[in-house]
């Protein structure tokens, strides 16, 4: 309702006008246009697409559209010296080699520049040795291997199945365990949904399909050679030995046909339990090494990829705000893909394109948003969120003073079952209210709201009659805005039914088979789910940019802070004696949370009552809302992770994709019983409680009456 009060508005120039202008047919057309050839970061094809998007955004009516370029470290296979893995006999002869490429999908046989499957930023090397199967290579999998099964991975090549956690964490864990190489593979248990055919006849992963992806552990640093600063023309670059987050051992991904050949010969220990078994017809023995007749055979990796400083291009479009041009609402998603990008990222980029077109249409009719909207097409997301991070580093001073919100727009779909939202608690009420006004695209929910179908299919585990909204983790371009800069952020997409489909991500993720046809034939033939996601993302941007009072509810932060404090306290109570011995108390944290709750409640009351016609008071109240997320930023960052500065949320140290609450305390408590110096370890727990309590209290005080 408040949106109608924006400047230059006429009755038709409201949220409804914006939403009605969004068309499924346009999204379909844009997706087709963006997916006909590969758009790998750092390539000419992706530069050309950047220029095309720049041109079209200008045509759509944005005030300005600029390219922002950076020279960052990227990684590519050697075109003349392909990567592969072999089984070698005792004479060193290669008796089996993994495939060098994925069989191209129908209609794409003659497309050039399809990058073969590789693990981006793998060092070169040709290690050979015995194989150890390490399940998903999670922290707990290595605990099981090393502590319970007494299996030593030192000097071994480990083979891990994709899924559950970010691949970079798998590689880090393998390195810490002493492995000399890592083979990543897609197990049908995780990437082949029962009852569905393989591509091109369905949306499942064929045996020759392989997931590409970077294996960095950047922890928010951006370009590995210029952490903290933009990779511009006068940048000082670190030497490769000092680069941030690069793996130290060779890594390579394979499909399940090739994995079968490696795993079927495995000997040594049996799998510890059924959770270590996938769906291949192999014993899933852990090793080390091959069984009986094959015990003299070894595995050898041949990795020849190179790291190269390469130019990348972001497209930045601006729609100037009429009333508060110095307040920025940002909608951003990446443009670069591993191959065709049918889902990742172009299902998102096509939605952004249509949102820009709709905003442009309104602007051409004389309307402007209250606040400035920035649109971004990021480059090199697949290589470590590089484009978004470099741009944010370059513009950090503006962003920290002017950034209202960031809405992410990567893949619009990872399924077609229901909505999935991850966002700051400040946006909960915005998302609830918006989805109540949108129509559900779901079968069986005709005439019902999106909120209703979403709540029915994905209920909150805590609040009856409400949908599940998850914590922000990382692995996408919101990271720098939320985790480093403290700008309120959110993301939305359509997802699968997590209850019935236990596979990780979607089966064809980062493979050559992620095509336009995959989406058009199997996921969203009518593009109705894409349209719904456009309405959610676009609707959020519209409200954030246009409502008189920012649509943030600080009381929802109070609720989650209590929940997170309860959770971390419960974890600490696994060690009640040590808590006593080292005088560990959570009193300060719970007191701060209580204060935050009371102050947030009073602020909300004032927000209802203040004189909205007074521009100074309005701006003051809005600034308190805008800067609340910023108040959770600790300038010193988290231990050993200086670019993760949000005290309430950070990507899990064990899985970049997942969000962890009170991450400083959580990490200090993690596996504390194994620490060699308990006094020091519990001292760090106490320090982290202190930091968290101080931060919550300080954030609360930003909501107090200013004088």
């Amino acid at each position: 309702k408040s949106s109608n009060e924006a400047t230059n508005i006429t009755p038709k120039h409201n949220m409804k006008a914006f939403l009605d202008e969004l068309k499924a047919e346009n999204i379909k057309k844009f997706l087709y246009n963006f997916t006909q050839i590969p758009h790998l970061a750092g390539t000419e094809q992706n530069f050309q697409l950047a220029k095309q998007i720049q041109s079209q955004w200008k045509e759509f009516g944005l005030d300005s559209v600029e390219l922002a370029h950076y020279d960052v470290l990227l990684s590519y296979p050697n075109k003349t010296h392909p990567n592969y893995i072999s089984i070698i006999n005792e004479d060193g002869n290669e008796i089996f080699n993994t495939s060098l490429f994925e069989p191209p999908p129908p209609g794409y046989e003659n497309v050039s520049d399809i990058v073969p499957p590789f693990s981006a930023f793998s060092p070169q090397g040709m290690p050979e040795g015995d194989l150890v199967y390490v399940n998903y290579a999670r922290t707990e999998d290595f605990f099981k291997l090393e502590r319970d099964m007494k299996i030593n991975c030192s000097g071994k090549i480990v083979i891990a199945r994709y899924g559950k956690v970010f691949r970079g964490n798998k590689v880090k864990n393998a390195q810490l365990a002493g492995a000399k190489g890592v083979i990543l593979y897609s197990d049908p248990a995780d990437y082949f949904a029962p009852g569905v055919k393989s591509y091109p006849d369905g949306w499942n992963l064929p045996g020759g399909g392989v997931q590409r992806g970077n294996i960095l552990n950047l922890n928010g640093a951006g370009d590995p050679l210029t952490p903290g600063y933009p990779a511009n023309e006068y940048a000082y670059r670190r030497g490769i030995a000092e680069a941030v987050g690069l793996p130290s051992i060779p890594v390579h991904p394979i499909g399940y046909y090739d994995a079968q050949k490696l795993l079927e010969k495995m000997g040594g220990s049996a799998p510890p339990d059924s959770s270590w078994r996938g769906s291949l017809k192999v014993p899933y023995n852990v090793g080390p090494g091959f069984t009986g007749n094959f015990s003299t055979q070894k595995v050898k990796m041949h990795i020849h990829s190179t790291n190269e400083v390469t130019r990348i291009y972001n497209v930045i479009g601006t729609l100037r705000g009429a009333v508060e041009p110095d307040r920025y609402v940002i909608l951003g998603g990446h443009r670069d893909s591993w191959v065709f990008g049918g889902i990742d990222p172009q299902s998102g980029a096509a939605v952004v394109h249509e949102i820009v077109r709709s905003f442009g249409t309104l602007k051409k009719e004389g309307w402007r948003p209250r606040r400035t909207i920035l649109f971004a097409s990021w480059d090199a997301e697949e290589f470590g969120l590089l484009g978004s991070t470099e741009w944010a580093e370059e513009n950090s001073r503006l962003l920290q003073e002017r950034g209202v919100a960031y809405i992410n727009a990567d893949s619009s779909i990872e399924g077609n079952y229901t909505l999935r939202v991850d966002c700051t608690p400040l946006m909960y009420s915005l998302v609830h209210n918006l989805t109540k006004e949108l129509k559900s695209p779901d079968e069986g929910f005709e005439g019902k709201s999106l909120y209703e179908s979403w709540t029915k299919k994905s209920p909150s585990p805590e609040f009856s009659g409400m949908p599940r909204i998850s914590k922000l983790g990382s692995g996408n371009d919101f990271e720098v805005f939320f985790q480093r800069l403290g700008i309120a952020s959110g993301r939305a997409r359509y997802t699968k039914n997590w209850e019935t489909n236990k596979f990780s991500g979607y089966p064809l993720y980062h493979s050559v088979y992620e095509t336009y046809e995959l989406v058009e034939k199997f996921y969203d033939p009518m593009f109705k789910y894409h349209l719904t996601v456009a309405q959610v993302r676009g609707g959020m941007v519209f409200e954030l940019a246009n409502s008189i009072v920012l649509p943030f509810d600080c009381r929802d932060y109070a609720v989650v802070l209590r929940k997170y404090a309860d959770k971390i306290y419960s974890i600490s109570m696994k060690h009640p004696q040590e808590m006593k011995t080292y005088s560990v108390s959570f009193d300060s944290l719970f007191s701060a949370v209580k204060n935050f709750t009371e102050i947030a409640s009073k602020f909300s009351e004032r927000l209802q009552d203040f004189d909205k016609s007074n521009p100074i008071v309005l701006r003051m109240m809005n600034d308190q809302l805008m800067f609340l997320e910023r108040a959770f930023i600790d300038p010193l960052g988290l231990p050993d992770r200086p670019f993760y500065r949000h005290v309430i949320y950070a990507p899990s140290s064990h899985n970049k994709y997942a969000g962890e609450s009170f991450p400083g305390i959580y990490d200090a408590l993690f596996d504390i019983e194994s620490k060699v110096d308990p006094s020091k370890a519990w001292g760090e727990v106490k320090r982290q409680i202190y930091v968290a309590a101080f931060t919550v209290q300080a954030a609360a005080e930003t909501l107090s009456e200013v004088a």
């Epitope: 585990p461 805590e462 609040f463 009856s464 929940k563 404090a565 309860d566 959770k567 306290y569 419960s570 974890i571 109570m573 696994k574 009640p576 004696q577 006593k580 959570f586 719970f590």
Partner: antibody
Framework: EVQLVQSGAEMKKPGESLKISCKGS????????VGWVRQMPGKGLEWMGT????????RYGPAFQGQVTISADKSISTAYLQWSSLKASDTAMYYC??????????WGQGTLVTVSS | QAVLTQPPSASGTPGQRVTISCSGS????????VNWYQQLPGTAPKLLMY???QRPSGVPDRFSGSKSGTSASLAISGLQSEDEADYYC???????????FGTGTKVTVL
């Protein structure tokens, strides 16, 4: 609304096994310890033990160690208390209860277990 | 198994003030906070007071708690008929690594 809902009353014979349940709702079940408390007829409250559903870390009161088993299934937000061989002296009301920083703050409605030949 | 000692009963007429004591040791009350629970006839216990003297929302302010050393007490001022119930104190015990409850006090409104 934060709630713990327990399974219904049980009438058993000595030597029989039993498993009673406690289902949580209205909060993140996996992130809070869930304890069990016994109240024998006409008597006071006795703390039996507790479980952290997220990883099934379990603690028992000295009098109950080896006498009962506490377990949980976080996927269905349910905690359990079980006996492999009941005795007449196990006749009591059993409460599950959520434990937080503020102590035992939410209680189930109780499950009456009667053991008689 | 109760290690906290309470008087078995207490009584008063409506409007009177009633106090219940709870005595423990250094390993429980002496080093941890005390909670109080009210158990109305035929119902489950309910949290009445946490952290020695904090009332959950919905608990009338006629209930108050305090702690000193290894003892705690619950006071009901302006006793009402609906206060007729059993009252239990509880605290974490560091040596047992678990909760200990009081023996319970039956409050009767005369």
């Amino acid at each position: 609304e934060v709630q713990l809902v327990q399974s219904g009353a049980e009438m058993k014979k000595p030597g029989e096994s039993l498993k009673i349940s406690c289902k949580g709702s209205g909060y993140n079940f996996a992130s809070y310890w869930v304890g069990w408390v016994r109240q024998m007829p006409g008597k006071g409250l006795e703390w039996m033990g507790t479980i952290y559903p997220d990883d099934s870390d379990t603690r028992y009161g000295p009098a109950f160690q080896g006498q009962v088993t506490i377990s949980a299934d976080k996927s269905i937000s349910t905690a359990y208390l079980q006996w492999s061989s009941l005795k007449a002296s196990d006749t009591a009301m059993y409460y599950c209860a959520r434990d937080s920083y503020y102590g035992i703050d939410v209680w189930g409605q109780g499950t009456l277990v009667t053991v008689s030949s | 198994q109760a290690v906290l000692t309470q008087p078995p009963s207490a009584s008063g007429t409506p409007g009177q003030r009633v106090t219940i004591s709870c005595s423990g040791s250094s390993s429980n009350i002496g080093s941890n906070t005390v909670n109080w629970y009210q158990q109305l006839p035929g119902t489950a216990p309910k949290l009445l007071m946490y952290s020695n003297n904090q009332r959950p929302s919905g608990v009338p302010d006629r209930f108050s708690g305090s702690k000193s050393g290894t003892s705690a007490s619950l006071a009901i001022s302006g006793l009402q008929s609906e206060d007729e119930a059993d009252y239990y104190c509880a605290a974490w015990d560091d040596s047992l690594n678990g909760y200990v409850f009081g023996t319970g006090t039956k409050v009767t409104v005369l």
